[in-house]
């Protein structure tokens, strides 16, 4: 039994997968912030989690996926105001009773120390200092991401 949040997440991911391949992104678009091999867009309006997910999709991006603790810290270092919360692409899967990223993978329990309950209609937000479980209907800001395409160095023969 999938929750409405899970269905929304799956639908958006599937529609993203159906879109035609685009040329790789070599530089971050204006207004996007480069963080290593990603471009991040921090919203300045608020939305519930599923609307945030949809908004990122319209920008040909996704809600932020965080690979590990190191990436979390680097992302949090960009957040200036301690009081502001941002949705990321992680929510509670009722059917699998686990935290699930919007790309279908499950949270490695060592990656994020989540404050709050793991239960139905819970989604994950980050602040400058912490990671929180919030009701997915809560209206807060969000972070979209685009992956940068790695540029392979060309090797030229000696001239």
């Amino acid at each position: 039994q999938k929750s409405s949040i899970e269905k929304c997440s799956v639908d958006i991911q599937q529609s993203r997968n159906k879109t035609t391949e685009r040329p790789g992104l070599l530089n971050c678009p204006i207004y996007w912030q480069q963080l290593r091999e990603k471009c991040l867009l921090f919203s300045h309006t608020v939305n519930p989690w599923n609307n945030s997910l949809a908004d990122c999709s319209t920008k040909e991006s996704s809600l932020l996926l965080i690979r590990d603790k190191d990436e979390l810290i680097h992302t949090q270092n960009l957040i200036r105001d301690k009081a502001i919360l941002f949705w990321i692409g992680l929510n509670f899967s009722l059917s699998e009773k686990n935290w699930k990223w919007i790309n279908g993978s499950f949270l490695n329990s060592n990656d994020l120390e989540i404050r709050g309950d793991a239960k139905e209609n819970s989604c994950i937000s980050i602040s400058q200092t912490s990671v929180y479980s919030e009701y997915c209907s809560t209206e807060i800001r969000w972070i979209c991401q685009k992956e940068l395409t790695p540029v392979r160095n060309k090797v030229y023969p000696d001239s």
Epitope: I30, Y31, Q33, L41, F42, S43, H44, L78, R80, I84
Partner: antibody
């Protein structure tokens, strides 16, 4: 509604640092992109750069080595510093709110009224 | 950087006439990323049009914007005395943000 007001010295000596502040009233600085633009007398507009409310910046490459834009959320203002100025930096300096990318690109609105900075010894 | 070229440099018309101002980009600009501003002597620019064709709040409907790719147009359907000013286009689709050199609209 949101209003912006530039302040700072109107005269700066060559090789010194130009410092201006833009005070935001009628709204919070903790959203949007906050921009500086300048206009030399009788010439066109030149974008200097912006700071986002989270503190990240983007500068015009032609000025990048000399410019710093900073933000003070507690005072609801943002600032411009331009180092090693010359006569070519004489201009009216404007601050403006940039709607950035929130689904639509909103453009620069509103603007401050502008302040003339003359670089001369 | 994207260079915006506005034409004509000066446009001389009478009140009641139609004004057509052009802005040409050196490379393609998404229509979402083009704006027009009006500037009167001694004043800050005022946003007229964003997203190439959307009127900003409080802008009369005699102002309209159109275009895509590299060619954009600002049209003022019937000139009022207060419309005589300098008009600037601006692109904000790629960094650095750039402005055109301006078109001066003067009374004939």
């Amino acid at each position: 509604q949101v209003q912006l007001q530039e302040s700072g010295p109107g005269l700066v000596k060559p090789s010194e640092t130009l410092s201006l502040t833009c005070t935001v009233s009628g709204g919070s600085i903790s959203s949007n992109y906050w921009t500086w633009i300048r206009q030399p007398p009788g010439k066109g507009l030149e974008w200097i750069g912006y700071i986002y409310y989270i503190g990240t910046t983007n500068y015009n490459p032609s000025l990048k080595s000399r410019v710093t834009i900073s933000l003070d959320t507690s005072k609801n203002h943002f600032s411009l510093r331009l180092s090693s100025v010359t006569a070519a930096d004489t201009a009216v300096y404007y601050c403006a709110r940039d709607g950035g990318y929130s689904g639509t690109y909103w453009g620069l609105d509103p603007w401050g009224q502008g302040t003339l900075v003359t670089v001369s010894s | 950087e994207i260079v915006l070229t506005q034409s004509p440099g000066t446009l001389s018309l009478s009140p009641g006439e139609r004004a057509t101002l052009s802005c040409r980009a050196s490379q393609s600009v998404s229509s979402s990323h083009l704006a027009w501003y009006q500037q009167k002597p001694g004043q800050a620019p005022r946003l007229l049009i964003y997203g190439a064709s959307s009127r900003a709040t409080g802008i009369p409907d005699r102002f309209s914007g159109s275009g895509s790719g590299t060619d954009f147009t600002l049209t003022i359907s019937r000139l009022e005395p207060e419309d005589f000013a300098v008009y600037n286009c601006q692109q904000y689709g790629s960094s650095p943000i750039t402005f055109g050199q301006g078109t001066r609209l003067e009374i004939k």
